[in-house]
């Protein structure tokens, strides 16, 4: 009962975690304009993996996507690199988690097929939080790094009259829910892998038997061995809705007439 | 075709105040910021601050906190801009105008009021 | 603030001619993300409120002659009539609508001869 249950919330609390990876992905705010020192903004920046966007104080947004592949920072394609190899193991994953489910029957399915399994859902949840961890990680430390950069040249002065304001960003919502989301993946995983040993089924144990040979006698004692349970990481593989993953920032993006103005 | 009726004028005291009324019609009144522009005889426009009628979410110019108050009546389509403490500094065309859609300029805008600070 | 500075402060041209005139802001009005200049311009005809002409420095509001063009970007913009007409006898300003608060030129008067 107690390996159904760690089973069962490992493949829930995964699915919320690939859920959030896959919003995090598509959201828009990775990274936001910083209103420190100007909390109130007639015009302001954010960005994401896939476009950037500008809202204005108008309510009108305007997206455009980045519609280049080579001119794209490498650490960029790096996060979206990321990102997506865990979005595509823990959505494998949880493919492979609903099969090793202990409550879900699928012909003469035995114990040991469903422990391998689970160990492999578990190490595919836990590889694919560890990818979105990393994934937003790297940003958050370009972010950082860009930010004091910025910071450093905030004013350019031109022809010591006029003032070129650089616009510095921040971590923008995207990042926490990829950190959230990362973990609650890892910690799906890591529930699976704990449910697999409890799948796992007991060998017989045999009695020892003592082999005489001639000259010195030595005793073989086979047996007392578990199972192996084979490797396989509990991925919970998350399933996508249409239009599920999709947040209200994204919503946001697309103006309509009756956007405040 | 939007149309912002304001009053022609008003006349009034020194430290009286005034309430300046704007009339939205043939829009969507709540789905628009108003702002509201000052104008000296003579003179160039100064921005007072605006007011989102949907929520009463309002932004000043530093420049006239204290001084104008900016209100609407969502049951009327009115948007209202009270002055207080009047002065002859006052006196000026006041206009308010409909934020554009697209951007962050004013699209349309009343005729404005001329409002004549005299004892 | 940001400072909008406007020149001439007035200046005389026959009908037909080719006018240009200029505004000069104390910060960057072109915005990073979008690439687009949030300057707008407006033309005050006498005994009238302003009508915007030109919106993110260049882009021309619909109904507004294909005579008047924006033009400039970052600090420096200027508005161009191709041909002046009897009835462009306005103050031309320039607005900032990149920050708060919007500000806007002393503006240019036009007068035909």
């Known amino acids: 009962m107690a390996v159904t249950a760690c089973q069962g919330l490992g493949f829930v609390v995964s699915l919320i975690g690939i859920a959030g990876i896959i919003a995090a992905t598509c959201m828009d705010q990775w990274s936001t304009q910083d209103l420190y020192n100007n909390p109130v903004t007639a015009v302001f920046n954010y960005q994401g993996l896939w476009r950037s966007c500008v809202r204005e104080s108008s309510g009108f947004t305007e997206c455009r996507g980045y519609f280049t592949l080579l001119g794209l920072p490498a650490m960029l394609q790096a996060v979206r690199a990321l990102m997506i190899v865990g979005i595509v193991l823990g959505a494998i994953g949880l493919l492979v988690s609903i099969f090793a489910l202990k409550c879900i029957r699928i012909g003469s399915m035995e114990d040991s097929a469903k422990a391998n399994m689970t160990l492999t859902s578990g190490i595919m949840f836990i590889v694919s939080g560890l990818c979105a961890i990393a994934g937003v990680s790297v940003f958050a430390n370009m972010l950082v790094t860009n930010f004091w950069m910025s910071t450093a040249n905030m004013y350019t002065g031109m022809g010591g009259m006029v003032q070129t304001v650089q616009t510095r960003y921040t971590f923008g919502a995207a990042l926490f829910v990829g950190w959230v989301a990362g973990g609650l993946t890892l910690i799906g995983g890591v529930m699976m892998c704990i449910a697999c040993r409890g799948l796992a089924p007991e060998e017989t144990n045999y009695k020892a038997v003592s082999y005489h040979a001639s000259g010195h006698s030595v005793a073989y004692k086979p047996g007392g061995f578990k199972a192996s349970t084979g490797f396989g990481s509990n991925t919970k593989n998350k399933k996508i809705y249409d239009g599920g993953a999709r947040t209200e920032d994204e919503v946001q993006s697309y103006p309509s007439k009756h956007d405040y103005v | 075709q939007v149309l912002l009726q304001q009053p022609g004028t008003e006349l009034v005291k020194p430290g009286a105040s005034v309430k300046v009324s704007c009339k939205a019609s043939a829009y969507t009144f709540t789905s628009y910021w108003i702002h509201w522009v000052k104008q000296r005889p003579g003179q160039g426009l100064e921005w007072i601050g605006r007011?989102?009628?949907?929520?009463?979410?309002?932004t000043y110019n530093q420049n006239f906190k204290g001084k104008a108050t900016l209100t609407v009546d969502k049951s009327s389509d009115t948007a209202y801009m009270q002055l207080t403490s009047l002065t002859s500094e006052d006196s000026a065309v006041y206009y308010c105008s409909m934020g554009a859609y697209y951007s962050n300029s004013f699209g349309y805008w009343g005729q404005g009021s001329l409002v004549t600070v005299s004892a | 603030d940001i400072v909008m500075t406007q020149s001439p402060s007035s200046l005389t041209v026959t009908a037909r001619e080719k006018v240009t005139m200029n505004c000069k802001s104390s910060q960057s009005l072109l915005n990073s993300g979008n690439q687009k200049n949030y300057l707008t311009w407006y033309q005050q005809k006498p005994g009238q409120p302003p009508k915007m002409l030109i919106y993110?420095?260049?882009t021309r509001e619909s109904g507004v002659p294909d005579r008047f063009t924006g033009s400039g970007s970052g600090t420096y913009f200027t508005l161009t009539i191709s041909s002046v007409q009897a009835e462009d006898l306005a103050v031309y300003y320039c607005q900032n609508d990149y920050s708060f608060p919007f500000t806007f030129g002393s503006g240019t008067k036009l007068e035909i001869k």
């Open positions: 993110w420095a260049s």
């Open positions: 007011i989102r009628p949907s929520d009463s979410d309002s």
